[in-house]
Amino acid sequence: SGVFQLQLQEFINERGVLASGRPCEPGCRTFFRVCLKHFQAVVSPGPCTFGTVSTPVLGTNSFAVRDDSSGGGRNPLQLPFNFTWPGTFSLIIEAWHAPGDDLRPEALPPDALISKIAIQGSLAVGQNWLLDEQTSTLTRLRYSYRVICSDNYYGDNCSRLCKKRNDHFGHYVCQPDGNLSCLPGWTGEYCQQPICLSGCHEQNGYCSKPAECLCRPGWQGRLCNECIPHNGCRHGTCSTPWQCTCDEGWGGLFCDQDLNYCTHHSPCKNGATCSNSGQRSYTCTCRPGYTGVDCELELSECDSNPCRNGGSCKDQEDGYHCLCPPGYYGLHCEHSTLSCADSPCFNGGSCRERNQGANYACECPPNFTGSNCEKKVDRCTSNPCANGGQCLNRGPSRMCRCRPGFTGTYCELHVSDCARNPCAHGGTCHDLENGLMCTCPAGFSGRRCEVRTSIDACASSPCFNRATCYTDLSTDTFVCNCPYGFVGSRCEFPVGLPPSFPW
């Protein structure tokens, strides 16, 4: 689609005569008829296949024609066409005399023709005007012409339609040859594809507008190059989505079980020694004078029962003080004022004199103790069982019943079968009295969680169009990571292409 433009510049008819030689009365009131048609070697009458146009009366006899294009007038004359410009044409320009106001051909006498010119040739589309001058015996016509493309048409023949747009179907302007020139931030054949944020991961990221980076399932970060670990993963990382690979010192499916509490949290206070005692567990061994789980509290000095022989302990500002029962004295009521003559030994204890009778010592029968055999032996009072062991009196002896994971006479030895992380696939390890037990995450079984019991959700290749499949271990479901151009939970739908253009 284009326009043949004809610019009339000057017409000379000095004598003011018609083609017949007869003069015009009072002068030749001149208008023009233009006929544009296909190329003819010899221009002959017939249909104006490319179009016709007439002018009003432009002047009398000789005159210059004003350029009216800026004012919306009729010069240059416009001959639009709705086809591919063939590159050749024939042009007939007739000058007529209008005796009255009716310029229709049927209203004019046949001899009203002033002059007629006919040209033909080739003409390429372009902005430049071709100047021409045609002279007959009585008249001269100066004019110029050209062919230009209509709006949105481009190319040598005005055959390429291109309409700039900035919407869902494209983001471009048109080059002079009709090719698309994408707006900044867009690419692709029809400039529909946004150029994502620089560095946005090709597979794991995408965008719906320029300089954006949206992440596909399982990925995160400004450039979608960081995988998302398993939901609930506390102290772990991933190299592909939904993994949870534990950092050193952590265990369990979610890496939330602290295998090295002492190092991670330093809970023990006042110079106490910290020992890890299984998952998320520790024991503080307090320095003398401190107590509490974390040795965070001072110990009242009377708590260690320093007073002997039934003496009672009183806390004081500068320590403690023992109130001794009758017959005893000393800082801890350790000295006796009695002798064997006073029968000081209870519960069948036998008395032995010391220091020439100034002192004595009681030899107690089994199950009794104290300097006067006054106390029944409770071999558990000193709380000899370490690590939470339970002390049991067994007649003259005692026994420690240890918590799982501990052994030894006083439960002082830690037997952690879990220390070497025997449970596979993030299984949780539990120390038992006779070994260990693994609690397996969903999808695994066996004594050490070594058997994969769940059906691999990706095994059936559920993803289409070369999409990448990831298995979500927690739910035994799959996630498809679609390549560019496909959507849907299985990447089964192609993204809609723009409607084809009409050429």
Partner: antibody, heavy 119, light 108 residues
Framework: QVQLQESGPGLVKPSQTLSLTCTVS??????????WTWIRQHPGKGLEWIGY???????HYNPSLKSRLAISVDTSKNQFSLKMSSVTAADTAVYYC???????????WGQGTMVTVSS | EIVLTQSPGTLSWSPGERATLSCRAS???????LAWYQQKPGQAPRLLIY???SRVTGIPDRFSGSGSGTDFTLTISRLEPEDFALYYC?????????FGQGTKVDIK
């Protein structure tokens, strides 16, 4: 802000075991520096510290009550509990659960639950 | 155990007056590990002061604590109507943790 809520029977018979639970909300019981504590207040009297537990299971009791106490924690439910055996009328009190952080100053308290020991 | 004695048991003041509450320990409290609490009827205690003199965030600056060793003081510079309540001191230096028997601040 962490909130605490005590729950349990308001009436216990003598010689039986008193059982109370404290639920931690708007925060996790798995706080490294927190001591989850039980405190009681006898009617018209002062406050008495019972003992505490950490989320790791470590416990420390008031020596005067130790033989009758068992404090436990359930991190999955965000709760800790108190069991006191062989109760007498002298154990009638308002029982509070409280949180101490770092040192034993109690910055968050439950609203308290009245427990009466009576036949 | 460390016994804390608060005196007097009850004090009567008028709003706007300065109130001074005393807490004496049976043994020296190391690191000034002493706290003060306010308790109103039917409510749980509220922490006011820790470390003998550090005010808890959100507690009005009319409350101040002082003292060391065995003698400690809570001062309310200008009593407001909402300050009339029961006040307890607490030591957290030595096991078992102990509280004073309380001082009641009454309106005169």
């Amino acid at each position: 802000q962490v909130q605490l809520q005590e729950s349990g029977p308001g009436l216990v018979k003598p010689s039986q075991t008193l059982s109370l639970t404290c639920t931690v909300s708007d925060g996790s019981i798995n706080s490294v520096e927190s001591y989850w504590t039980w405190i009681r207040q006898h009617p018209g009297k002062g406050l008495e510290w019972i003992g505490y537990i950490k989320y790791t299971g470590g416990i420390h009791y008031n020596p005067s009550l130790k033989s009758r106490l068992a404090i436990s924690v359930d991190t999955s439910k965000n709760q800790f509990s108190l069991k006191m055996s062989s109760v007498t009328a002298a154990d009638t009190a308002v029982y509070y659960c409280a949180r101490a952080r770092g040192s034993h100053t109690f910055d968050v308290w439950g609203q308290g639950t009245m427990v009466t020991v009576s036949s | 155990e460390i016994v804390l004695t608060q005196s007097p048991g009850t004090l009567s003041w008028s709003p706007g007056e300065r109130a001074t509450l005393s807490c004496r320990a049976s043994q020296s409290i190391s690191s000034n590990y002493l706290a003060w609490y306010q308790q109103k009827p039917g409510q749980a205690p509220r922490l006011l002061i820790y470390g003998a003199s550090s005010r808890v965030t959100g507690i009005p600056d009319r409350f101040s604590g002082s003292g060391s060793g065995t003698d400690f003081t809570l001062t309310i510079s200008r009593l407001e109507p909402e300050d009339f309540a029961l006040y307890y001191c607490q030591q957290y230096s030595r096991s078992p943790i102990t509280f004073g028997q309380g001082t009641k601040v009454d309106i005169k």
